[in-house]
């Protein structure tokens, strides 16, 4: 605490702006204001990174007004060391009490590096499961940024549920954050609106993202699986292939099932949606197989669970890796797909 | 141009910094410095985005030294007036001349945001065309004054030759930039490294970027072809399907022939390689047909070039809309692929 | 200037728990992942896990998810990692180094503790 | 677990001369564009020390003599002309999948 026959100083750092352009000038002078204080003995140092540094300080210029002094110094940095991140310090002592401000380059302000996205149920939650969630997914942020905040509301006001959290550090050194939050089947069929808000003390503004069933035509997808042809030196194996298209809108989920039982994901491969040349979507999906599942039971199912398919949201079709003979030729002659 | 009988100021801008965090303060300050000038009236003007701003000026305050007068104005803003990147300028007349500096927020210095990409030749340049070429692909730039420099070497020394430059505005507001750098077959092949250099006044490191053709073990794709049987409604059109597997590496070119003639590249869709649960990749590419291309001749050629398939680095697979019924045996019987 | 100054030389005996210190200097400690690497005599790097010091949420090698513990404090700018249910295997250089935003290596490291378990 | 094998283990160079140590990867450290392979260099007593990042980024600080190329599965780091400080053992490292892991480095001694 100061004794009360001196006025303190107050310190604060200005710098050079950058031009009408928003560039960096190639030099950057930091300057330290030290203002009214009562005349006397003061040190001023400058600190990069929290050490001192080795800055001439005959350059410092005071000037009184009134009963108070006023005191200025300047540092000069190359426009490198100051875009480098460091942070720099104006440290001031007087009668024995030290006084400081501290300064880095402004944070980046445009989120351009951070993206939010905010996904729909997937259709198979929606319509099997009967418990759907919506994923919003925050990426690019930095690890300082994890403390980053993710608010959940609906355009009706109504509540929402509880939301769980997940963090994950990407192999390029960014981090992405997720929070998933349980919806109400019938309040997502009926058009509810869900609003993601990500807020963080470094972002110049909260990003907001929303999300609701998807307007627009519905059409049902087709369904197609085939059977590769054994392959020299893979007896042993088979691909399977599903091609799914022409549904609307583009949400789907896509299944394998042998024996009845739905094969777990990490068994196929399905492409994201990509659009037909008319107005609807296509997936393929590719799935291996072995003899011991095949000659077990030879007919797998690829089945798409997609809302305009009726009766009960599914489409599905089933294929052998060893057709027998009549099939082959039903299908040559062109009947119906199933 | 000034007469000889004052000292005209000296105008710049010093604006209050972010504090060591790099955060910005919730009010920035610009303070307009007007220095070194013979006592004379003088009149500050503040701008913004070039409109007169209606700022109380009553704060100006001057003072002399010798016999040269300065004069300091300052302007508060908001944070948010600050981060929307308007352009503010200090205008000063003076003696019937107007000085003046301008600033705005400094440009976003990392490169958070900008991701650079150096791909590949395809293989359909490299082996068939055999004029193989690189790109360099450097995204969501923020457009502003200072150009991106893309700069070609190679890991050899050896001369680069004449690169072409793109430059596209994406509809989110950032600037893609390519640079397109034709290369020897036979360098390439040989296992040349070839280096992008992309710098940029923002940017405060450069981004490198390096390709050499992939190494590790190689495998010729496996190329099967299928047609969608009719389906109800569609009469007319027919989706052909291919799907090309246990190729390594990663580098594929998929093309589609009707009468001996290779079809445009937009009229297929091809899916990005993926991994298979082996060590292989595998893509799908998917064709549209119509009734007067079939009945003109109904056979349809899914040709993948990659470097692993012999003889020609090719590897094809023919498709008929309706396959002959001994085809369809053939097949079902499990003859070989071709 | 960065700086990673890991604690003193440990000695302990088998079935102990030691916890060794990383204090950081020179930078926003926050804004960093910190990671820990293992080296053992005459042997090779082995990479233990990492934290964000902002959150202390955590990612371990499979082979020392049982083994360490790595937590921080973000007051006093200190990464810690604590390795429990000591083994003469466990004699070794213990690193901490930093990973940046956007970068996938390690530009700065600790000097290193080593870690003798003996009976 | 990506498994690095760099080699030869052990490498004796005259002043001046090439030197090239190799590090192949059991599967491809190439992600989106970019590569996640990186080396390092180790003195006695020391931390390890950050030459080179991405394949063939030489760290800030560090001489033009060393290089890196490579991409894939197949890295070599080139040191020309080798000088007596180069004396170390050098480590390369992928960080594409977790767990990150180090190859069995390579010692290089100058004759």
């Known amino acids: 605490v100061c004794s009360r026959d001196f006025t303190p100083p107050t310190v604060k750092i200005l710098q050079s702006s950058c031009d009408g352009g928003g560039h960096f000038p190639p030099t950057i002078q930091l300057l330290c204001l030290v203002s009214g204080y009562t005349p006397g003995t003061i040190n001023i140092t400058w600190l990069e990174d929290g050490q001192v540094m080795d800055v001439d300080l005959s350059t410092a210029s005071t000037t009184q007004e009134g009963e108070l002094a006023s005191t200025q110094s300047e540092l000069t940095l190359s426009q490198k060391h100051w875009l480098s991140d460091r942070t720099y310090t104006c440290q001031v002592t007087y009668q024995g009490h030290t006084f400081e401000d501290s300064t880095k380059k402004c944070a980046d302000s445009n989120p351009r590096g951070v993206s939010a996205y905010l996904s729909r149920p997937s259709p198979f939650d929606l319509f099997i499961r009967k418990s759907p969630t919506i994923t919003c997914l925050v990426v690019d942020l930095a690890p300082s940024k994890g403390t980053v905040n993710l608010t959940w509301s609906r355009a009706s006001g109504k509540p929402v549920n509880h939301s769980t959290r997940k963090e994950e550090k990407q192999r390029n050194g960014t981090l992405t954050v997720t929070s998933t939050l349980p919806v109400g089947t019938r309040d997502w069929i009926e058009g509810e609106t869900y609003q993601c808000r990500v807020t963080h003390p470094h972002l110049p503004r909260a990003l907001m993202r929303s999300t609701t069933k998807t307007s627009g035509p519905r059409a049902a997808p087709e369904v197609y699986a085939f059977a590769t042809p054994e392959w020299p030196g893979s007896r042993d194996k088979r691909t399977l292939a599903c091609l799914i298209q022409n549904f609307m809108p583009e949400d789907i989920s896509v299944q394998w099932l042998h024996n009845e039982v739905q094969l777990p994901d990490a068994r196929h491969s399905t492409t994201q949606p990509r659009k037909t040349k008319g107005s609807g979507f296509f997936v393929f999906s590719r799935l291996e197989v072995t003899r011991a599942e095949w000659e077990q039971k030879d007919e797998f199912i690829c089945r798409a669970v997609h809302e305009a398919a009726s009766p009960s949201q599914t489409v599905q079709r089933a294929v052998s890796v060893n057709p027998e003979l009549d099939v082959c030729v039903e299908e040559a002659e062109g009947e119906a797909p199933w | 141009v000034c007469s000889r009988d004052f000292t005209p100021p000296t105008v710049k801008i010093l604006q209050s910094s972010c504090d060591g965090g790099g955060h910005f303060p919730p009010t920035i300050q610009l303070l307009c410095l007007v220095s070194g000038y013979t006592p004379g009236t003088i009149n500050i003007t503040w701008l913004e985005d070039g409109q007169v701003m209606d700022v109380d000026l009553s704060t100006a305050s001057t003072t002399q030294e010798g016999e040269l007068a300065s004069t300091q104005s300052e302007l508060t803003l908001s944070q948010k007036h600050w981060l929307s990147d308007r352009t503010y300028t200090c205008q000063v007349t003076y003696q019937g001349h107007t000085f003046e500096d301008s600033t705005k927020k400094c440009a976003d210095s990392n490169p958070r945001g900008v991701s650079a990409y150096l791909s590949r030749p395809s293989p359909f340049d490299l082996f068939i065309r055999k004029s193989p070429t690189i790109t360099c692909l450097v995204v969501d730039l923020a457009p502003s004054k200072g150009t991106v420099n893309l700069t070609w070497s190679r890991a050899s020394g050896k001369p680069v030759n004449h690169s072409t430059r793109k430059e596209e505005k994406q509809r989110n507001g950032t600037l893609t930039v390519t640079s397109t750098l034709p290369v020897g077959t036979r360098d390439w092949i040989e296992g040349e490294t070839y280096q992008c250099r992309v710098t940029h006044p923002h940017l405060p490191r450069a981004l490198m970027r390096s390709t050499t053709k992939t190494s590790g073990p190689r495998a010729a794709p496996e190329v099967y072809a299928f047609a969608t049987p009719e389906w109800p409604g569609s009469r007319d059109k027919r989706t052909l399907a291919c799907l090309i597997q246990n190729f390594m590496p990663e580098d594929i070119s998929v093309q589609w022939l009707h009468n001996e003639v290779q079809l445009p590249d937009a009229r297929h869709s091809t899916t990005q390689p993926r991994k298979t649960k082996g060590s292989g990749f595998f893509v799908f590419s998917r064709l549209e047909v119509t009734r007067a291309e079939w009945e003109q001749k109904d056979e349809f050629i899914c040709r993948a070039v990659h470097e692993a398939a012999s003889p020609s680095q090719t590897v094809q697979r023919a498709v008929s809309v309706n396959p002959e019924l001994d085809v369809c045996v053939e097949e079902a019987e499990g003859e070989a692929p071709w | 200037q960065v700086q990673l100054q890991q604690s003193g030389a440990e000695l302990a005996k088998p079935g102990a728990s030691v916890m060794l210190s990383c204090k950081a200097s020179?930078?926003?400690?926050?804004?960093?992942?910190m990671h820990w690497v293992k080296q053992r005599p005459g042997q090779d790097l082995e990479w233990i896990g990492y934290?964000?010091?902002?959150?202390?949420?955590?990612e371990y090698n499979q082979k020392f998810k049982d083994k360490a513990t790595l937590t921080a404090d973000e007051s006093s700018n200190t990464a810690y990692i604590e390795l429990s249910s000591l083994t003469s295997d466990d004699s070794a250089v213990y690193y901490c180094?930093?990973?940046?935003?956007?970068?996938?290596?390690?530009?700065?490291w600790g000097q290193g503790t080593l870690v003798t378990v003996s009976a | 677990d990506i498994v690095l094998t760099q080699s030869p283990a052990s490498l004796a160079v005259s002043l001046g001369q090439r030197a090239t140590i190799s590090c192949k990867a059991s599967?491809?450290?190439?992600?989106?564009?970019?590569?996640?392979m990186n080396w390092y260099h180790q003195k006695p007593g020391q931390p390890p020390k950050l030459l080179i990042y991405?394949?063939?980024n030489l760290d800030s600080g560090i001489p033009a003599r060393f290089s890196g190329s490579g991409s894939g599965t197949d890295f070599t780091l080139n040191i020309h002309p080798v000088e007596e400080e180069d004396a170390a053992t050098y480590y390369c490292?992928?960080?594409?999948?977790?767990?990150?892991?180090f190859g069995g480095g390579t010692k290089l001694e100058i004759k």
């Open positions: 180094a930093r990973q940046e935003y956007r970068h996938s290596w390690f530009a700065y």
């Open positions: 020179g930078y926003t400690f926050n804004g960093y992942w």
């Open positions: 934290i964000n010091p902002t959150t202390g949420h955590t």
């Open positions: 599967q491809s450290v190439d992600y989106d564009g970019d590569t996640y």
């Open positions: 991405a394949a063939s």
């Open positions: 490292q992928q960080t594409n999948e977790d767990p990150w892991t």
